[in-house]
Interface confidence: low
């Protein structure tokens, strides 16, 4: 197997879409698989076409974290396997901006994924660090939820409430609209009581370097950094 066109590395903004191309040839026509950070690609769309002994594979991704994407072309001559690899990195420009920047506005939640969790007509904080805050934050919830994959029935509603209230934070309107973070106690209850096993899995992933923890914290809060309801009951939101 021989790679004719290797995927290209990209430096993109958070919430962008990227299409990675990989073209290979060989006799017989090779198969192409994509690897993300050492594992099979868990999300994204793969399209393939074969013409004149050339296979073209396109992986389209919604970028919420940096990663190393490897295209592996394999074919088999008799008992012998032939493999070719090519890799590309996806890095995120200004990836920490949404964390640091509190610029945004209050608006009624009009999305779908958090409909059952957020109060009807809830005022949420939309972060103007994103080009399209509603769409970006909505997709961020989806992506974060995919990270949880298989969760227990006990964890699911608690995690859903935590994610939705963290990404679509309650908004305090005023001259400077302000997001109201979740109270530390509620975050800890989800982490240590309802979703202890699941949380461990996510932290394990972070330690293994599968994604930068700062990026990861955009979707799952770091409980210790949240305000306590005992300090100021109005400074944080209760789930």
């Amino acid at each position: 197997a021989r790679i004719l066109r290797a995927p290209e590395s990209h430096n993109v903004t958070f919430g962008s879409f990227v299409t990675l191309h990989c073209t290979a040839t060989g006799i017989p026509v090779p198969t192409i698989t994509w690897i993300e950070n050492g594992n099979a690609v868990s999300s994204g769309s793969i399209q393939e076409s074969v013409k004149d002994r050339v296979i073209d594979s396109r992986l389209q991704l919604f970028i919420t974290k940096p990663g190393l994407y490897t295209c592996i072309a394999t074919n088999k001559h008799g008992e012998k396997f032939s493999t070719a690899k090519a890799a590309a990195t996806i890095s995120i420009a200004e990836w920490s901006k949404p964390q640091k920047d509190n610029k945004g506005y209050c608006a009624q939640y009009r999305g779908e994924v958090c409909n059952a969790v957020l109060a009807k007509d809830a005022l949420v904080f939309l972060n103007t660090s994103y080009a399209d805050p509603e769409e970006a934050q909505e997709l961020l919830v989806h992506t974060a939820w995919n990270e949880l994959k298989v969760v227990s029935p006990v964890c699911r509603p608690a995690a859903e409430a935590l994610l939705c209230n963290h990404i679509f934070q309650e908004c305090s309107p005023g001259v400077v609209p302000t997001p109201i973070p979740i109270c530390r106690e509620y975050c800890l209850a989800v982490k240590e009581l309802f979703c202890a096993k699941e949380w461990l899995v996510m932290e394990e992933k972070t330690h293994r370097g599968l994604y930068r923890s700062e990026m990861h914290l955009l979707s799952v809060p770091e409980c210790s950094k949240l305000p306590s309801m005992h300090w100021d009951p109005t400074a944080c939101a209760r789930l």
């Epitope: 299409t19 769309s45 399209q47 919604f62 080009a131 769409e135």
Partner: antibody, heavy 120, light 106 residues
Framework: QVQLQESGPGLVKPSESLSLTCTVS????????WSWIRQPAGKGLEWIGR???????NYNPSLKSRVTMAVDTSKNQFSLKLSSVTAADTAVYYC??????????????WGQGTLVTVSS | EIVMTQSPATLSVSPGERATLSCRAS??????LAWYQQKPGQAPRLLIY???TRAAGIPARFSGSGSGTEFTLTISTLQSEDFAVYYC????????FGGGTKVEIK
């Protein structure tokens, strides 16, 4: 060969709802995202929204409050409902297949289009 | 919303000549761009996706190029059946189309 066919009333009264159905043949409706796109006479194309059979959907923000999409997998059909229509909703309505899987893509198969006129 | 701007609005070309159509995005869309051809009374037909990949069954005289915000569709040798309206469409965020370029016989 994938084929899409739109059907529905050609005339709708203002303030009422426009309802269209798209019948897909030559492909399983469960395998792709499916979109609705419209084109007012002599003008450009406007994407209305799309859905996947699992219930995941995305809508054009400017139309979102008025749009509902549904699917009948047993008939390999999907539908569009646009409420509170005005004369500005008069257009040729197309159904189309989204060529990519999970994320937005290009539209590789289209229906022939059906003209909907909003008039009293 | 990502706004797509096409130019020129009308392009007058003689059969056998080369036609170059431009499309500009209001922000970077990487290579998430498609081109369509539409003839009167017909649905659009996909020509190019991912900015430069020809769709199935599209003749080699159609080619696409560009990335980021500037894109070009080139028809190397115009045939009589190529006179139509051409639209670009981005799919980096929710899909939006350009206003179209009409390619007419000179």
């Amino acid at each position: 060969q994938v084929q899409l066919q739109e059907s529905g009333p050609g005339l709708v009264k203002p303030s009422e709802s426009l309802s269209l159905t798209c019948t897909v043949s030559g492909d399983s409706i469960s395998s792709y995202y499916w979109s609705w796109i419209r084109q007012p006479a002599g003008k450009g194309l406007e994407w209305i929204g799309r859905f996947y059979t699992s219930g995941r959907s995305n809508y054009n923000p400017s139309l979102k409050s008025r749009v509902t999409m549904a699917v009948d997998t047993s008939k390999n059909q999907f539908s569009l409902k646009l409420s509170s229509v005005t004369a500005a909703d008069t257009a040729v309505y197309y159904c189309a297949r989204d060529g990519f899987g999970s994320y937005f893509g290009s539209f590789d198969y289209w229906g022939q289009g059906t003209l909907v006129t909003v008039s009293s | 919303e990502i706004v797509m701007t096409q130019s020129p609005a009308t392009l007058s070309v003689s059969p056998g000549e080369r036609a170059t159509l431009s499309c500009r995005a209001s922000q970077s869309i990487i290579s998430n761009l498609a081109w369509y051809q539409q003839k009167p009374g017909q649905a659009p037909r996909l020509l190019i996706y991912d900015a430069s990949t020809r769709a199935a069954g599209i003749p080699a005289r159609f080619s696409g190029s560009g990335s980021g915000t500037e894109f070009t569709l080139t028809i190397s040798t115009l045939q009589s059946e190529d006179f139509a309206v051409y639209y670009c469409q981005q799919y980096n965020k929710w899909p939006t189309f350009g206003g179209g370029t009409k390619v007419e016989i000179k």
